[in-house]
C-alpha cells in the first residue's frame, strides 16, 4: 500500500524548491524499479516529483490566502512490467499559514449618528475587521481593536469592535468627531500586523437649549394714527439647538394695557409686536411690556433644560401725529325763532385741538348766506329767517388749525327755524259757486276749507264769518262747522240772474294763534237759469267759467 | 459709578438764550433716555423735556414748547439744553436726569445749575 | 396731563415712627407707571420706588410703595434721621409729572 505523512508546505517560501514530502509503496525495496508520477492540478508547474525516490518538491511561492491546498493524485508504475503497482491515490498538499495579512476593515467609510449628550456606555457602532489569515492557525487571525483617535469621548471593545460613548458630548460645543480605531492581529503579540479605520460619528440635537433673548431691552415706536393689526416691530431670541429644536413661540407675560400682542413667525423664528389696540400720544405716550419665549416642543425628559423662559422688555414709545381739531359734540342742532333781526345768536359749537400744542381754531361756514360763525364758535343770522320759506337749514361747520390749516373737520349743525304766528288763514283753494235763481233759503251753495302756513303748535283752528257788511245785508249766511270748514248757504229765496247776476261774499278767517291772525277772502257766486230739477245749469257765465277751467258743480 | 454733571448756568436778562450742558459717565450713555427736570426756587420740580437714546426723538412740556431745545452728543457724552427767549419763570435749577434703562423713572440725577432770568 | 396731589402737605414726625404718604391722580395712571423720590435740602432728589412698589438699588426696606390707578402711598416704616426731607411722587404714565412734595419734618 501507499506510505506517506501529512503534507504541508509554508506559504511564502522565497526558495525554488521546497521539499514537500514522499510518497512511496512499501513493496519499493529501492532498487528504483519503480516510477512515482503526480497527477491533478498544480502537478507539474507547482509540484514536482522525483520519479525514483517519490520526494515531492514545490517549486512556486505558495499563497495560502489564494489556495490553502492542493488535491493530488499519485500513481506508481513498476517499470519492468508497466503495470500499477499501487491503484492510483488522492492526496493532499496543505498549504500552512504564515501572519503575512494585516486586519482590513472592509465596510469603510463608517459613519454614525447618536443623540448629543447621550450617557455613558451608549453604543454608537461596531466596526469589524478582517484577516485573510487562517484563522485555525495560532494567533495570526485573532484580532484586538483599539482607540487612536476619540479619547475620551468613546471607547471600543477590544474584542469585538463595538464603539461606546465614554463621556458626554454637546452638540452645540462639536457636532462631529473623527474615531480612529485599529485592529491588531496575533492579538497584539510582538510581529502583529494592524489595520486602521475612521469614522465619522455625528451627533443629532437633542432640546437641550431654550430659546434666549440677545437684548435685554426692545424699543419700538408706533404712531398714534396706526390701525389695530399693524407691526409695530420685531424682536428675536436665539436657540443654540437646530431644527424643529429651534422652534419657538413668543408671547406677552406682563401688558397691563393689553394693547399689544407678539406672534410668531415660524420660519423667521421672530417675535413681530403687533397693536391689538389704537393707542393715543396725549393718553399715554410710552408703554412697557415684557416678552416671554419658548420652545414650541419639548420632551417630558428635557424639561429641566426649560424651567425658566427667557424673558426681555420692551419699550413701545408713542409717536404724536398731528390731529384734527375735536368737536365736542358729532352734530349740533340749535333753535331761532323766525322773523328775528340780521344779527340774532343761534349756537356756539366748541372744537379743540386733541394735540399737545393745543393750536387755537378758526371756524367756518361752507356755502352760507344765510348764517355767520366767529373764531369763538359762535353762530348768528345774516339775515331775518322766515320759516314758511325754510324751517331747517344743515350747515356744515368746519373747525381749522390756527397753525396747520391742512388740520380742518367738519360737522353737521342743524338750526329748526321756530314758528311765530306770522300767516293768517286763507282759503286752502281758489272757489267759484253758483247759486239758481229759483233756489229756496238754506240752500247749501259752497263748502269751503282754509289753510295757514304758520306751523300749528297743537292743531290748527280756525274761524269763519262774513264781513259785517254782509252779515248786514247779506243774501247768503255762513255756518263753522268746528272741523276747519264752513259752509255757504242761501238766506233768502229767489235770485235774479238780470239785476244781480254774480255776488261777492266777503269771508273772515280767524287761527287760533297768539295774537290770532284774521284774513279776509273774497267767494264768488254767480247766479245761474235753472231747470226745476236744478241740475240743468243754463248760466250766463257758464262758458266764461268752463273757459278758466272752473267747475260749478 | 454712574456719574451726571451739569454746566452751562448762570444770569441772563429775559428774552436771551442759555445753553446748559450736561457730561455723562461711568455708564454707556448712548443706551439711555435722558431728560432735565428743573426746579424754581422753593417749589417742586417739573419735568422739562426728554431725549430718546439715539436722538431721533424729542418731546418737552407746554411751559418750554418751541423755546428750549434738547439735544446730546454721543460721542462727547453729553446732553444738552438750548434755552432761547428766556423768561423770569424759567428761574430755576435745572437737573440733568437718567431714565432707567427697564422703566421710565428717574434713577441718576446731576446736582444742578442755576439759571436766573432777571432784567 | 395728570395731575398729582399729594398729602399731607408737611409730616411732622419723631425719629422711629412710622411715616404715610399719600399721592392722588387726577386720571387713572397704567401700569403702575408711578415713581417716589425724595430730596434733601440743597441735594438732587433720589430715587426711592418705581413702578409704585419696586424699590430701587440701595433703597433700605424701611420704605415701602403701594397702589393702583389712582391712589398711591409711600411708607417709612420707621423714620431714620436721613429721612427727614420732601418726598415728590411722578407720574411717567403719560409724559412725567411730578406732586407738589410733602414735607417731612422733625417733630
Known amino acids: 500500500g501507499w506510505v506517506w505523512n501529512q503534507f504541508f508546505v509554508p506559504e511564502e517560501m522565497n526558495t525554488t524548491s521546497h521539499h514537500v514530502g514522499r510518497l512511496r509503496s512499501d513493496l519499493d525495496n529501492g532498487n528504483n524499479s519503480f516510477q512515482y508520477k503526480l497527477l491533478g492540478a498544480g502537478a507539474g508547474s507547482t509540484f514536482i516529483i522525483d520519479e525514483r525516490t517519490g520526494d515531492i518538491y514545490a517549486i512556486e511561492k505558495l499563497d495560502r490566502e489564494e489556495r490553502s491546498l492542493y488535491i493530488l493524485r499519485a500513481q506508481v508504475i513498476d517499470i519492468t512490467t508497466g503495470r500499477a503497482v499501487e491503484p492510483e491515490s488522492e492526496f493532499v498538499i496543505k498549504v500552512s499559514d504564515i501572519n503575512d495579512n494585516e486586519p482590513k476593515f472592509l465596510d469603510e467609510p463608517y459613519e454614525a449618528i447618536v443623540p448629543e449628550m447621550s450617557p455613558e456606555g451608549t453604543l454608537v457602532i461596531q466596526v469589524t475587521a478582517s484577516d485573510a489569515d487562517d484563522p485555525s492557525s495560532g494567533n495570526n487571525a485573532r484580532l484586538l481593536y483599539s482607540l487612536l483617535q476619540g479619547q475620551p469621548y468613546f471607547s471600543v471593545e477590544p474584542t469585538t469592535g463595538v464603539i461606546r460613548i465614554s463621556s458626554k458630548m454637546d452638540r452645540e460645543l462639536q457636532d462631529e468627531y473623527w474615531v480612529i480605531i485599529q485592529a491588531k492581529d496575533m492579538i497584539g503579540q510582538p510581529g502583529a500586523l494592524s489595520g486602521t479605520t475612521s469614522v465619522l460619528i455625528k451627533l443629532s440635537d437633542v432640546n437641550d437649549n431654550k430659546p434666549i433673548f440677545k437684548e435685554s431691552l426692545y424699543r419700538l415706536t408706533v404712531s398714534e394714527s396706526a390701525p389695530t393689526g399693524t407691526s409695530i416691530g420685531t424682536i428675536m431670541a436665539y436657540d443654540n439647538d437646530i431644527g424643529e429644536n429651534a422652534e419657538m413661540d413668543y408671547s406677552i407675560e406682563e401688558d397691563d394695557s393689553q394693547t399689544f400682542d407678539i406672534i410668531t413667525n415660524h420660519e423667521t423664528q421672530e417675535g413681530i409686536v403687533i397693536l391689538k389696540k389704537k393707542v393715543n400720544f396725549e393718553h399715554q405716550n410710552h408703554y412697557g411690556i415684557r416678552a416671554k419665549v419658548k420652545n414650541h416642543h419639548v420632551d417630558e425628559q428635557l424639561m429641566k433644560y426649560h424651567t425658566e423662559a427667557s424673558t426681555t422688555f420692551i419699550k413701545i414709545q408713542v409717536e404724536d401725529v398731528d390731529e384734527p381739531p375735536l368737536f365736542l359734540l358729532p352734530y349740533y342742532i340749535f333753535e331761532i325763532f323766525e322773523e328775528t333781526p340780521q344779527g340774532s345768536f343761534v349756537g356756539v359749537v366748541s372744537a379743540t385741538d386733541p394735540d399737545n400744542r393745543k393750536s387755537p381754531i378758526r371756524y367756518s361756514i361752507t356755502r352760507s348766506k344765510v348764517f355767520n360763525i366767529d373764531d369763538n364758535g359762535t353762530i348768528t343770522t345774516t339775515n331775518s329767517l322766515d320759516r314758511e320759506i325754510s324751517a331747517w337749514y344743515n350747515l356744515s361747520i368746519t373747525a381749522t388749525e390756527k397753525y396747520n390749516i391742512e388740520q380742518i373737520s367738519s360737522i353737521p349743525v342743524y338750526v329748526q327755524v321756530l314758528n311765530i304766528n306770522d300767516h293768517a288763514p286763507e282759503f286752502s283753494q281758489y272757489y267759484e259757486s253758483y247759486v239758481c235763481e229759483n233756489a229756496g233759503s238754506g240752500q247749501v251753495i259752497q263748502t269751503i276749507s282754509a289753510v295757514d302756513r304758520d306751523e300749528s303748535i297743537e292743531e290748527h283752528h280756525f274761524y269763519f264769518n262774513l264781513s259785517v257788511e254782509d252779515t248786514n245785508s247779506s243774501s247768503f249766511t255762513i255756518i263753522d262747522n268746528q272741523d276747519n270748514t264752513a259752509v255757504i248757504l242761501t238766506n233768502r229765496t229767489g235770485f235774479n240772474l238780470q239785476e244781480e247776476p254774480i255776488f261777492y261774499i266777503s269771508i273772515l278767517i280767524a287761527d287760533n294763534g297768539i295774537p290770532s291772525l284774521t284774513s279776509t277772502n273774497t267767494l264768488t257766486i254767480h247766479v245761474c237759469d235753472c231747470d226745476d230739477s236744478g241740475s240743468t245749469q243754463t248760466c250766463q257765465y257758464q262758458e266764461l267759467m268752463l273757459s278758466m277751467g272752473f267747475k260749478t258743480e | 459709578q454712574v456719574q451726571l454733571v451739569e454746566s452751562g448756568g448762570g444770569v441772563v436778562q429775559p428774552g436771551r438764550s442759555l445753553r446748559l450742558s450736561c457730561a455723562a459717565s461711568?455708564?454707556?450713555?448712548?443706551?439711555?433716555?435722558m431728560h432735565w427736570v428743573r426746579q424754581a426756587p422753593g417749589k417742586g420740580l417739573e419735568w422739562v423735556a426728554v431725549?430718546?437714546?439715539?436722538?431721533?426723538?424729542?418731546y418737552y412740556a407746554d411751559s418750554v414748547k418751541g423755546r428750549f431745545t434738547i439735544s446730546r452728543d454721543t460721542s462727547k457724552n453729553t446732553l444738552y439744553l438750548q434755552m432761547n427767549s428766556l423768561r423770569a419763570e424759567d428761574t430755576a435749577v435745572y437737573y440733568c436726569a437718567r431714565e432707567r434703562y427697564f422703566d421710565w423713572s428717574f434713577d441718576y440725577w446731576g446736582q444742578g445749575t442755576l439759571v436766573s432770568v432777571s432784567s | 396731563e395728570i395731575v398729582l396731589t399729594q398729602s399731607p402737605g408737611t409730616l411732622s414726625l419723631s425719629p422711629g415712627e412710622r411715616a404715610t404718604l399719600s399721592c392722588r391722580a387726577s386720571q387713572s395712571v397704567s401700569n403702575t407707571y408711578l415713581a417716589w423720590y425724595h430730596q434733601r435740602p440743597g441735594q438732587a432728589p433720589r430715587l426711592l420706588i418705581y413702578g409704585a412698589s419696586s424699590r430701587a438699588t440701595g433703597i433700605p426696606d424701611r420704605f415701602s410703595g403701594s397702589g393702583s390707578g389712582t391712589d398711591f402711598a409711600l411708607t417709612i416704616s420707621s423714620l431714620e434721621p436721613e429721612d427727614f426731607a420732601v418726598y415728590y411722587c411722578q407720574q411717567y404714565s403719560n409724559s412725567w409729572t411730578f406732586g407738589q412734595g410733602t414735607k417731612v419734618e422733625i417733630k
Open positions: 431725549i430718546s437714546y439715539d436722538g431721533t426723538n424729542e
Open positions: 461711568g455708564f454707556t450713555f448712548s443706551s439711555y433716555d
